[in-house]
Amino acid sequence: FSIMENNGQPCINDDEEMKEVDLPEIEADSGCPQPVPPENGFIRNEKQLYLVGEDVEISCLTGFETVGYQYFRCLPDGTWRQGDVECQRTECIKPVVQEVLTITPFQRLYRIGESIELTCPKGFVVAGPSRYTCQGNSWTPPISNSLTCEKDTLTKLKGHCQLGQKQSGSECICMSPEEDCSHHSEDLCVFDTDSNDYFTSPACKFLAEKCLNNQQLHFLHIGSCQDGRQLEWGLERTRLSSNSTKKESCGYDTCYDWEKCSASTSKCVCLLPPQCFKGGNQLYCVKMGSSTSEKTLNICEVGTIRCANRKMEILHPGKCLA
């Protein structure tokens, strides 16, 4: 059994009835001029004149792929028989968004499956979806070019008060986790020292409860709790924090001796060990990496080293005895 009617006959292409042998005779000077490739495409076997019956193959530039039938056929009348072919992007271009929005991660091109997060300055939230995924040559969901930032409900409520508080006449009072937190607010990963457990909590609820003097609640990181280095460090940081002499409020968080509050992001960022000031009487005797020698470090150095995920064993609080 053969799927070809004329077994063994030379065919031009699978979807054509005409065979090479049935093509009309070619005059010496007849043929087709070079065809125009689709946008972002080029002709692989490029030349000035093509013989009748000759095919040209359309290829696409890097970052694009052919969609449709990529061969053009030179016809006896000097024209090209061409199906619908186009070069479609296989990557997404960094979207053009309003200047107020920040794109993370910030790249020129994104591969299929990669996602971006849009964020707003402090006190504002994205007025629409904040997460987008590259699918084929476009973003899903589509990114509206009118997408902007709007005042965060938390910020609206709080007026001139601190986070977790609301304006009541001329004074600031704590928000009620039940009454004032029915609106959507971003998820935070939070640690409860009483129950010795971590859980995901809406930001509004966490801040309201913290304001109501629930000192056992500690911010771990923005986003829902997920196993990994961020959670691991958040828990270790909470343990170290009890000995910190510095406790500086910073957005949802509190910064400690080994951290600085970033003015632009309102997040606590670990210092690097050389940035630690020597002062302070919170000392620890430690062993670094695989070293056998003991070293006295201050709490800032201990915090920065652990934050950087460098191997260090805390032997005991206070100076090394040796």
Epitope: P105, H221, G228, R229, Q230, W233, K260, S262, S264, T265, K267, V269, C270, L271, L272, P273, P274, Q275, C276, F277, K278, G279, K295, C307, A308, N309
Partner: antibody, heavy 118, light 112 residues
Framework: EVQLVESGGGLVQPGGSLRLSCAAS????????MAWVRQGPGKGLEWVAT????????YYRESVKGRFTISRDNAKNTLYLQMNSLRSEDTATYYC???????????WGHGTLVTVSS | DVVLTQTPLTLSVTPGQSVSISCRSS???????????LYWYLQKPGQSPQLLIY???DLGSGVPDRFSGSGSGTDFTLKISGVEAEDVGVYYC?????????FGAGTKLEIK
Amino acid sequence: EVQLVESGGGLVQPGGSLRLSCAASGFSFSDYYMAWVRQGPGKGLEWVATINYDGSSTYYRESVKGRFTISRDNAKNTLYLQMNSLRSEDTATYYCARPSTEALFAYWGHGTLVTVSS
Amino acid sequence: DVVLTQTPLTLSVTPGQSVSISCRSSQSLLNDVGNTYLYWYLQKPGQSPQLLIYLVSDLGSGVPDRFSGSGSGTDFTLKISGVEAEDVGVYYCMQASHAPYTFGAGTKLEIK
């Protein structure tokens, strides 16, 4: 006001030695890590070495390990860089730098030029 | 070592014009706890470098707010909104997310 003044630079032959000094004032010298950063003629910047408060921990870039030694004398408020087995690629202006909570190299001296040439 | 590639190498601008300098890293500068140690320095002619921006987007002490930093991962930008004559010099980006600390080759800003 934080002030860092480098000295000790000069012309030296390949294989030779030189000792740079950085006199610090305007802050409590022994409370800070200190560093050396260099800049080749018409070139970019390159971190060289860092030392902790009391000199018990030192860190070097790979290309100078075993040849350069960073040290300090807290009583004299002075940072040093002993450079041995000098090579032509060590030709640069050497800056002394102090960190702050903002950055590793927040305060810089005016630099001292080291030329390694035969 | 992490390579920081700055573009353009030279910028020739007129006072009041806004400019951007790009700094691209050979690997992500975002560490596993979410911190990015990227800095911008300006070295004015005949002077030592001075800190402009730290931690990607925080303004250094005493730095005019016409300077701003942005970016994440491997792509970072320094923007000067309305260049002034005193802004001439070489701009360097520097990373401290990975040892050893490394600097970009610099971008020279000159006034037309």
